[in-house]
Interface confidence: low
């Protein structure tokens, strides 16, 4: 059992109060983390509470302001970036969000040597992406889908690409589907380690079908938003990778990097680029049918000024039981010899582990092993490899940081975090300085989050960076719910669950149960992290039991569980939620006449299918921005797990797994369907089709749309949404207002 340390006990119980919905909507109990912005082995930058940019030197203990809040305020800057030679800072303002990661902004360059903004050859606006070279102060930026280079901030720009066109050709930035489903970044350009070369992707969306939706705004006529968006089976972007010498950019111009022949024989994706040295680069490619990935190491040919990718440097990663990788194919971390690398992929037992690849993948040396999974490689130094895993005490929802000594033989393993603050901290991430001289640990729970600074050689804690004291004090008089993480063993499947229980929970009483589900492939909901959110309020104030269950298809418990849903989305995820509910009823404290389920996005799909399962278990449920048919969702994501919606592939299951096909089954449940009309991700079309099917089947249901809101339903919509859902659930559970 994991009981979250909820508070420092106050002897005067009558001063304790339950959480309110207002607490949640106001973010009263939000926490802070501290991630140093490392600029060397022993120095980092941090934006202080009063908005000064401060440089800290760990070894001297000194700190000084490099940029005042007055300078920041003069251009309304919300972000900054120091050039590696420490001569200039870019200041970012006029932030304008586009999709999940992308945004445009105005950039000003501030010269630290003379305390003035750089005048002449100013940057155009708005810029889609801007970054310094890793050495010196060269600038690369993307404007109107084309890439530009400046040797110095005050110099005129050199235009690298000329074919950029809105919604057609994207240079140095991803199109919608690559941003959301493949790169998970706003950029698609990469400097070589010393800034000699700049690699970039070109995405050609000319032939991609366009999703169009109305944006109502305030005008007499709504605007139409058009996004090239490949749905399952549709034409995909065509990607090409180029590299340009930034020292003499006009000399030979951008050189295209060849695609491995076995990849190029059919539709494919580019998945990531990793520079190894200034003259060696590693590209990862993926077949459209995403069970084969190729890692290709390419070398610069000085004589031809081209990039050569010999077949002997192609490493194939293939899955015979599912798709390649976890959510994404893992990226390599190269060792100091600049050819061998460390990478996480499935071992022979079907668990994701770190492997060392020297020559071929077949001859890979397995570095970690066990019935748990390595999750992230943080840093490889000459003598150590730092990684995270969920090995400790066999809880898949934990994350601890480990160090493996690779300089000695046999390599020894040490858990850096397991015993630091064992009750408070079981879910960590880390951030390392150059050469791992120092690192920050950020603990997300289950107790109140805390960020600490450590010596990279001895692992000694140097200081606390952020301990959320104000939050701790604010929670002292709050009746937080209890949380427990346990597992159910059902038919050789382990179902981990998190149960959130009312503060005065009594096993002899009956409580309404709300299942919160996500359930998407390679996701994990049952995690040992701190949160005070809507479901905390529902348990604390409204006396509900809330449960989260990780069923088949979820991550970090081996390929058997993960790949169980391959080509069959919408089947086992739903079955496992239902199985868990039956087990919860058997525990004796659930009122089986008051059970609900809710989910957002993939969770909205699962909750809809669970409600329409015909089991009679659920009284009501909510689907927020659900997928309703996999034919409506993005190709890259959908086909990874479902194959293609073609007759000779998997069309039959595409058709069988829709929410619409089960419209009749909603007759005996109360269903609340919610969607934003400007959802660029899971299109409003999904809910429109559910509503149409329910109307055609003459099934009553409730619905709410949020005009001009995207997949996140942010701002005032958030308040309205949670208030609306609260009323719905309280009505369903016959709880008084």
């Amino acid at each position: 059992i994991v009981l979250r340390p909820s508070r420092v006990h106050n002897s005067e119980e009558n001063t304790m109060r339950a959480l309110t919905l207002k607490d949640i909507l106001n973010g009263t109990f939000s926490y802070k983390t501290f991630f140093p912005n490392w600029i060397s082995g022993q120095e980092y930058l941090h934006q202080s509470a009063d908005n000064n940019i401060v440089l800290y030197n760990i070894e001297t203990g000194q700190s000084y302001t490099i940029l005042s809040n007055r300078t920041m305020k003069s251009v309304n800057a919300s972000n900054y970036g120091l050039s590696p030679d420490r001569q200039f800072v870019y200041l970012e303002s006029d932030y304008s969000k586009l999709w999940r990661y992308s945004y445009t902004a105005t950039y000003y360059i501030y010269d630290l040597s003379n305390g003035e903004f750089v005048r002449g050859n100013e940057l155009p606006r708005p810029i889609q992406y801007l970054c310094w070279s890793p050495v010196g102060s060269k600038l690369a930026y993307v404007y109107q889908n084309n890439i530009y280079l400046k040797q110095r901030p005050g110099d005129p720009p050199f235009q690298i690409t000329f074919n950029g066109r809105e919604n057609k050709i994207f240079n140095g930035i991803p199109d919608w589907v690559y941003e959301e489903e493949m790169l998970a970044t706003k950029y698609a350009l990469w400097w070589s380690p010393n800034g000699k070369f700049l690699a970039y992707a070109e995405f050609n969306d000319t032939d991609i079908p366009v999703i169009a939706y109305s944006y109502y705004g305030d005008e007499q006529y709504p605007r139409t938003i058009n996004i090239p968006y490949p749905k399952a089976g549709a034409k995909n972007p065509v990607v090409r990778i180029f590299i340009i010498d930034t020292t003499y950019p006009a000399y030979v111009g951008p050189q295209e990097v060849p695609v491995p022949a076995m990849i190029a024989s059919s539709d494919y994706y580019f998945s990531w680029l990793t520079w190894v040295t200034d003259e060696r680069v590693c590209l990862q490619w993926l077949k459209r049918v995403q069970n084969v990935s190729v890692l290709s190491i390419c070398d610069f040919r000085e004589d031809w000024q081209t990039w050569d990718c010999p077949k002997t440097q192609e490493h194939i990663e293939e899955s015979r039981t599912g798709w390649a990788g976890g959510f994404f194919v893992s990226t390599p971390v190269f060792s100091y010899d600049a050819i061998s690398y460390y990478k996480i992929f499935s071992d022979k037992d079907g668990y994701k582990h770190i492997h060392y690849i020297k020559d071929t993948v077949e001859n890979a040396i397995q570095i970690t092993s066990g019935k748990w999974e390595a999750i992230n490689i943080f840093r490889v130094t000459q003598d150590s490899l730092f990684y995270s895993s969920n090995e400790f005490e066999e809880y898949p929802g934990r994350r601890n940081i480990y160090r493996i000594s690779i300089g000695s033989y046999p390599p020894s393993k040490k858990c850096v975090t397991c015993h630091l603050r064992k009750e408070r901290c079981q879910y960590y991430t880390a951030s390392f300085s150059d050469y791992a001289k120092y690192y920050a640990l950020v603990c997300y729970g289950p107790g109140i989050p805390i960020s600490t600074l450590h010596d990279g050689r001895t692992d000694q804690e140097i200081k606390i960076l952020e301990e959320n004291k104000e939050l701790e004090n604010a929670l002292k008089n709050i009746q937080l719910p209890k949380e427990e993480i346990k597992k159910l063993e059902v038919d050789e499947i382990t179902l981990w669950y998190k149960m959130i229980l009312p503060p005065q929970f009594d096993r002899s009483k009956k409580y309404p149960l709300l299942i919160q589900v996500y359930g998407g492939p390679c996701s994990q909901s049952v995690r040992s992290v701190f949160a005070v959110n809507w479901i905390s309020y529902l348990a604390s104030k409204e006396g509900m039991v809330i449960a989260l269950v990780d069923g088949r298809g979820t991550a970090f418990q081996g390929d058997k569980l993960l790949y169980a849903v391959y080509r069959k989305l919408g089947v086992y995820e739903v079955e496992d939620q239902i199985t868990a509910v039956r087990k919860f009823i058997e525990m004796g404290f659930i009122d089986e006449k008051r059970i609900a389920i809710w989910g957002w996005s993939y969770g909205g799909y699962v909750s809809s299918l669970a409600l329409a399962s015909g089991t009679g278990l659920f009284k009501c449920g909510i689907a927020v921005a659900p997928v309703s048919s996999w034919e409506y969702y993005a190709s890259v994501y959908t086909e990874r797990f479902m194959g293609l919606p073609t007759k000779d592939d998997n069309l039959e299951h595409y058709k069988n797994s829709t929410v619409m096909a089960r419209a009749e089954y909603f007759r005996n449940v109360d269903y609340l369907l919610i969607h934003g009309t400007a959802d660029d991700n899971v299109h409003f079309q999904n809910s429109a089709q559910i509503a149409k099917a329910l109307v055609n089947a003459q099934v009553d249901f409730q619905a709410m749309w949020y005009s001009d809101q995207n997949h996140g339903l942010s701002g005032l919509s958030t308040n309205h949404l949670y208030t609306h859902m609260t009323h719905f659930l309280k009505q369903c559970f016959s709880l008084s207002d």
Epitope: G233, A234, A261, S265, K287, V289, L644, K647
Partner: antibody, heavy 124, light 108 residues
Amino acid sequence: EVQLVESGGGLVEPGGSLRLSCAASGFTFSDAWMNWVRQAPGKGLEWVGRIKTKSDGGTTDYAAPVRGRFSISRDDSKNTLFLEMNSLKTEDTAIYYCFITVIVVSSESPLDHWGQGTLVTVSS
Amino acid sequence: SYELTQPPSVSVSPGQTARITCSGDELPKQYAYWYQQKPGQAPVLVIYKDRQRPSGIPERFSGSSSGTTVTLTISGVQAEDEADYYCQSAYSINTYVIFGGGTKLTVL
């Protein structure tokens, strides 16, 4: 230089069998999806079937008129593609071509090659 | 079953522009390829992925795509362009390969 050379065609009676071969050279055969296409006298091109690479599962797909009667296989060590034809019908009379289309880097030309074809005549 | 529909014949005078269409319900999802076949010869690829031209194919050959129709355009037709032209749907993402019925281009 890429070459595809079909052989094994000839005259066969209805209900009979025939095995066609296609010898490939000049490219990495094991990386290519290989197809058979036929053309009846005076008619259009008709796809017969294809075999994927080993890395793509080595699976075969067939056009409806030949499914269950024809079988495609490959021998990557010998760079050879085969078409086993059983229960032949008069309407199977055609020139049979093997062909490969590999789209390489989008700035380059596709590798697209056909053999010269081999004539199969099914007649009593 | 899925079909690609082409006009049986198109006639055009030398120097004029010939347009050969090919329609099919799946063409919004699948690329089209165009082959030229002269009597007694194997087909030759003239357009791939709807609009790309292989090296060695004259610039007068171009391709376009709109909805369920793809079009092969030959501008400034020459006598040597007289041939049969076949469209083929892409097979790169596991659908079956399908050829259109072919269009005989006659240069008057």
